[in-house]
């Protein structure tokens, strides 16, 4: 004969566990039904009656099958530097992530607790390591033959243009200025592996590093100490 299908609540066989979407109620000593996501246990089961479930109230949720007496409260509304990427519903918590131009300086289980603006590299410095959702931009001085004339969290150092005749040599924060004849083309820095420029190499002045006012995030970076913030602005 086929085994009887037990309906909740039921007493489990000794040494066995309750089935999927059931839990063992210590008081009743019975296997009882869990409540589905979006619900909670309004009345716990007894030896003769199963769990009574009820829907979560506004701004509360349960994400899993459960037997909690109260639904969890959704997190607070997203701050102005965040965007809501998942709304608060009866079945899921609100998720806030950082808006473009910001990164997560302090994360939580889902989403972000604290966003910070991405560091901006000042003229003479370029982005050496782009910012990510969870890490800040790293700025580095422009190498000889390259420049950056912007304050930006995305711009890299760009090669100086080649001039047939240089009017003003380029430096770390300014492109070379050619005389009225047009430049041959934008150049990459000449090196062992690169063709040499038409004209004599531009004079290159390294910018003086200045400390950043951006917040330190050394404890947040996944691989070692925080990169230096020199060449960045805090705005």
């Amino acid at each position: 004969l086929p085994a009887q299908v037990a309906f909740t609540p039921y007493a489990p066989e000794p040494g066995s566990t309750c089935r999927l979407r059931e839990y063992y109620d210590q008081t009743a000593q019975m296997c009882c039904s869990k409540c589905s996501p979006g619900q909670h246990a309004k009345v716990f089961c007894t030896k003769t009656s199963d769990t009574v479930c009820d829907s979560c109230e506004d701004s509360t949720y349960t994400q899993l099958w459960n037997w909690v007496p109260e639904c969890l409260s959704c997190g607070s509304r997203c701050s102005s530097d965040q965007v809501e990427t998942q709304a608060c519903t009866r079945e899921q918590n609100r998720i806030c992530t950082c808006r473009p131009g910001w990164y997560c300086a302090l994360s939580k289980q889902e989403g972000c607790r604290l966003c910070a603006p991405l560091r901006k590299c000042r003229p003479g410095f370029g982005v050496a390591r782009p910012g990510t959702e969870t890490s800040d931009v790293v700025c580095k001085p422009c190498a000889p033959g390259t420049f950056s004339n912007t304050t930006s969290s995305t711009d890299i150092c760009r090669p100086h243009q080649i001039c047939n005749v240089v009017a003003i040599p380029g430096n770390a924060s300014m492109d070379a200025v050619c005389t009225s004849t047009s430049p041959t083309r934008s150049m990459a820095p000449g090196a062992v592996h690169l063709p040499q420029p038409v004209s004599t190499r531009s004079q290159h002045t390294q910018p003086t590093p200045e400390p950043s006012t951006a917040p330190s995030t050394s404890f947040l970076l996944p691989m070692g100490p925080s990169p230096p913030a020199e060449g960045s602005t805090g705005d």
């Epitope: 370029g126 982005v127 050496a128 390591r129 782009p130 990510t132 790293v138 580095k140 001085p141 190498a143 000889p144 033959g145 390259t146 995305t154 711009d155 890299i156 150092c157 760009r158 090669p159 990459a188 820095p189 090196a191 062992v192 592996h193 690169l194 390294q206 970076l221 691989m223 070692g224 100490p225 925080s226 990169p227 230096p228």
Partner: antibody
Framework: EVQLQQSGAELVKPGASVKLSCTPS????????MHWVKQRPEQGLEWIGR????????EYDPKFQDKATITADTSSNTAYLQLSSLTSEDTAVYYC???????WGQGTTLTVSS | QIVLTQSPAIMSASLGERVTMTCTAS???????LHWYQQKPGSSPKLWIY???NLASGVPARFSGSGSGTSYSLTISNMEAEDAATYYC?????????FGAGTKLELK
């Protein structure tokens, strides 16, 4: 004139370690990232990792995490790549490059053979 | 990690022919952080096009680059013998930095 001067070719036995060097002229390594790139014979380019010599911060491709160690000595303006437990798979040309990978060294040929 | 897929792996072109090779990223890459390199046997890679569309030093005007998001390309308007080489695309938008497997361009 910017150049990245790399150490000479190496012939080493399997199981050994080797340390390759890269010394730029024309800029201070504290002002850049130093990257290392691997190229096996007749193969493509593989990024190994990078170091920020200003603070010793390193990042590796997970594939090379247990194989490579990148270090830098700011006093001699030199970056290093140490490779351990060498096998024939490590036979390759190793290049160093600057922050934006604009400047590259001439490459160091490493041959692992018994 | 961002995987860069180059196609074709090998191609051949006649002198004067227009050549286009592509580089497809597994996830979006900022055009600022997408470079192309040219490499010939026995030499180090040479920066050829930086930030998607800017020609490096000494690169002939017949070369051009374009693209955005996940799709990038390098074009030679009229093939010359000296263009025979392997071309690699490279991204450093996200760590780990990655290279495409390369497109080997041969002279037909």
């Amino acid at each position: 004139e910017v150049q990245l001067q790399q150490s000479g070719a190496e012939l080493v036995k399997p199981g050994a370690s080797v340390k390759l060097s890269c010394t730029p002229s024309g800029f201070n390594i504290k002002d850049t990232y130093m990257h290392w790139v691997k190229q096996r014979p007749e193969q493509g380019l593989e990024w190994i990792g990078r170091i920020d010599p200003a603070n010793g911060y390193t990042e590796y491709d997970p594939k090379f995490q247990d194989k490579a160690t990148i270090t830098a000595d700011t006093s001699s303006n030199t970056a290093y790549l140490q490779l351990s437990s060498l096998t024939s798979e490590d036979t390759a040309v190793y290049y160093c490059a600057d922050t934006q990978l604009y400047y590259w060294g001439q490459g160091t040929t490493l041959t692992v053979s018994s | 990690q961002i995987v860069l897929t180059q196609s074709p792996a090998i191609m051949s072109a006649s002198l004067g022919e227009r050549v286009t090779m592509t580089c497809t990223a597994s996830s979006s890459v900022s055009s600022t952080y997408l470079h192309w390199y040219q490499q010939k046997p026995g030499s180090s890679p040479k920066l050829w096009i930086y930030s998607t569309s800017n020609l490096a030093s000494g690169v002939p005007a017949r070369f051009s680059g374009s693209g955005s998001g996940t799709s990038y390309s390098l074009t030679i308007s009229n093939m010359e013998a000296e263009d025979a080489a392997t071309y690699y695309c490279h991204q450093y938008h996200r760590s780990p930095l990655t290279f495409g497997a390369g497109t080997k361009l041969e002279l037909k």
